[in-house]
Interface confidence: low
Amino acid sequence: LDDACISNPCHKGALCDTNPLNGQYICTCPQGYKGADCTEDVDECAMANSNPCEHAGKCVNTDGAFHCECLKGYAGPRCEMDINECHSDPCQNDATCLDKIGGFTCLCMPGFKGVHCELEVNECQSNPCVNNGQCVDKVNRFQCLCPPGFTGPVCQIDIDDCSSTPCLNGAKCIDHPNGYECQCATGFTGILCDENIDNCDPDPCHHGQCQDGIDSYTCICNPGYMGAICS
């Protein structure tokens, strides 16, 4: 038999062979072509079975092939690959990156926020410190610098300045926001009520010696005198 392929009847890089039974050529076409001499394009996008593009990619027919226009988040000849948006390490501050379809989500470490966990959370934003406490922002927490007289995580505790019983001689202690006040028992004076009021000044005893007591005095009368004030 003559070589039917001598005239190169097959196109588009097809394989030509001579049929040993009838001497005719046989073209074995590459993918994407059809017809006796492989000159007809196969419209892969119009094939009845299914869209060759996965994940709802748009199929575009080309000469001898097709290509897929992929939706955001997919890649590959058939949109078969979910793009790993975490590959570029977009999350900052040791956040965990979760790959999503067409995007990513950063799971921030406590104390950080933002799409990329790039922002430090300002825990002082809500003004958590009371009683004029000064808020200092820290990572995932805050610290309150309390003014004198206050304590606690948010300066909410009024320090009881009376707890150390500073007032003496039975005085009543009154706690104030920034200190205390001693209300002295009768007969005492001073900031801490530690001073006994001198009831002998001025001297009440007319003819005798005055002895000071607590909120009282005693007159020791000279001979010949008597009475409370030796009068």
Epitope: D89, D94, T96, L107, C108, M109, P110, N140
Partner: antibody, heavy 115, light 108 residues
Framework: EVQLVESGGGLVQPGGSLRLSCAAS????????MSWVRQAPGKGLEWVSV????????YYADSVKGRFTISRDNSKNTLYLQMNSLRAEDTAVYYC????????WGQGTLVTVSS | DIVLTQSPATLSLSPGERATLSCRAS???????LAWYQQKPGQAPRLLIY???SRATGVPARFSGSGSGTDFTLTISSLEPEDFAVYYC?????????FGQGTKVEIK
């Protein structure tokens, strides 16, 4: 295949120490936060500690703070938990787990603290 | 600390029935950073759901998570024999990371 394998558990007396190891494979260890979670016999899960991918940040449960130390060697793909001053209540199966929520778990290693 | 309370403690159901497990947080879980795990006796836990509603790789579609803020739910639409296990919720919103006490799903 993503895999975590713990080792180092055993019986120890109260006040003693143990060092747990967790060998990781099948994923980029140096890019993942790693955690330790424990489970006392017949009880629920309890988070113990987590370490950032670089090892720069560590966090602990109050129950172990000051006694346990988490660390990692990214060149060896290994996570560690140094446990000191062990107490009876530390008796549990200790799991290492990937990330801050746990996509992958090891098989666990039993730590028994008893005299 | 964010305390997670799971209910019920035990759920007795038959295969094919629907299981609804609840997880309530003592305060709002930031960004719905809540996960669900399944644990069978003698095995390590297995991640089912993260981000309150996203199914982990290889988890059957009968498992679904929902909820936000302080109330979260894990639903198993039709129980298979292999689903009888203990289920835990976990928040990873704030330190300390906390787990619920677990819900045991047992065969009725």
């Amino acid at each position: 295949e993503v895999q975590l394998v713990e080792s180092g558990g055993g019986l120890v007396q109260p006040g003693g120490s143990l060092r747990l190891s967790c060998a990781a494979s099948g994923f980029t260890f140096s890019s993942s936060g790693m955690s330790w979670v424990r489970q006392a016999p017949g009880k629920g899960l309890e988070w113990v500690s987590v370490i950032a991918s670089s090892g720069s940040n560590t966090y602990y449960a109050d129950s172990v703070k000051g006694r346990f130390t988490i660390s990692r060697d990214n060149s060896k793909n290994t996570l560690y938990l140094q446990m000191n001053s062990l107490r009876a209540e530390d008796t549990a199966v200790y799991y290492c787990a990937r990330s801050i929520f746990y996509t992958t778990w090891g098989q666990g290693t039993l730590v028994t603290v008893s005299s | 600390d964010i305390v997670l309370t799971q209910s019920p403690a035990t759920l007795s159901l038959s295969p094919g029935e629907r299981a609804t497990l609840s997880c309530r947080a003592s305060q709002s879980v930031r960004s719905n950073y809540l996960a669900w795990y399944q644990q069978k006796p003698g095995q390590a836990p297995r991640l089912l759901i993260y981000g309150a509603s996203s199914r982990a790789t290889g988890v059957p579609a009968r498992f679904s998570g929902s909820g936000s803020g302080t109330d979260f739910t894990l639903t198993i639409s039709s129980l298979e024999p292999e689903d009888f296990a203990v289920y835990y919720c976990q928040q990873y919103s704030n330190f300390p990371i906390t787990f619920g006490q677990g819900t045991k799903v047992e065969i009725k």
